[in-house]
């Protein structure tokens, strides 16, 4: 797995360099997670044809993966910094159960899956420090998450492969939207 941001050899070799600002650190963290997702998607898509045919292959999707909507204030039209930041943190917290599900779903990229999960936890901490209105952030219920995880893991192999693909695709889209929004803050 790649080295997490801020731990590469260049940082050791150049102690005189300006430390990253909070915004730069968040930006770098998201890009690091996106790189990890890319690697995981590569393994998933090489293993099956689900990446091309997921739309036609499904009649219904009840995964309830977090998604940016107009009302969340993260798009250019109707941009609202505080509302958007709450949405990003809430969405990442909701994704955590799905990232937990992804563990043990990869043969050659097991470390990469763990790195994506751990880096997301760090990203949430960075963002929580940035947020003023922490009370508006709802944390998912652990019992509900445990039940969801059981349901996901009980699915047949085909459904689990499709679920993996959909989680990675949605998480990538969510992070890309978050990155764009955070750059406006």
């Amino acid at each position: 797995a790649p080295v997490p941001p801020g731990e590469d050899s260049k940082d050791v070799a150049a102690p005189h360099r300006q430390p990253l600002t909070s915004s730069e650190r968040i930006d770098k963290q998201i890009r690091y997670i996106l790189d990890g997702i890319s690697a995981l998607r590569k393994e998933t898509c090489n293993k099956s044809n689900m990446c091309e045919s997921s739309k036609e292959a499904l009649a219904e999707n009840n995964l309830n993966l977090p998604k940016m909507a107009e009302k969340d204030g993260c798009f250019q039209s109707g941009f609202n910094e505080e509302t958007c930041l709450v949405k990003i943190i809430t969405g990442l917290l909701e994704f955590e159960v799905y990232l937990e599900y992804l563990q043990n779903r990869f043969e050659s990229s097991e470390e990469q899956a763990r790195a994506v999960q751990m880096s997301t936890k760090v990203l949430i901490q960075f963002l929580q420090k940035k947020a003023k209105n922490l009370d508006a952030i709802t944390t998912p219920d652990p019992t509900t998450n445990a039940s969801l995880l059981t349901k996901l893991q009980a699915q047949n192999q085909w459904l689990q492969d499709m679920t993996t693909h959909l989680i990675l695709r949605s998480f990538k889209e969510f992070l890309q939207s978050s990155l764009r929004a955070l750059r406006q803050m």
Partner: nanobody
């Protein structure tokens, strides 16, 4: 495990109707998505219709929309396929299938359980 017994097939004239049934044995029938597939001679098994176990929504292949109706009776552990305005190209073995999960697949590889199939022949 769930056992599926599909029935109701037969020979019918073009323009006629048939009602297929699929009886499921086993627990928690209402948690399963129920799906009808069909396979014509020399062709791949194709999706016909589905009744969601999560949302009670129904879904159809374009080729049967407006002619076929899928319904389920959770009290009787049974799913039905009402087929009207039948055409010779509807001739196939019809299979009932069941799958549990948060996704409802339209492909045969996604199913958990299968019935043995019931033959529908539509003559012109």
């Amino acid at each position: 495990a769930v056992q599926l017994v599909d029935s109701g097939g037969g020979l019918v004239q073009a323009g006629g109707s048939l009602r297929l049934s699929c009886a499921a044995s086993g627990r928690s029938f209402s948690n399963y998505h129920m799906v009808w597939f069909r396979q014509a001679p020399g062709k791949e098994r194709e999706f016909v219709a589905a009744a969601s176990g999560s949302t009670s929504s129904t879904y159809y292949a374009d080729s049967v929309k407006g002619r076929f109706t899928i319904s389920r009776d959770n009290a009787k552990n049974t799913v039905y396929l009402q087929m009207n305005s039948l055409k010779p190209e509807d001739t196939a073995v019809y299979y009932c299938a069941a799958v549990a999960g948060l996704l409802l697949p339209r492909v045969a590889e996604g199913m958990d359980y299968w019935g043995k199939g019931t033959l529908v022949t539509v003559s012109s």
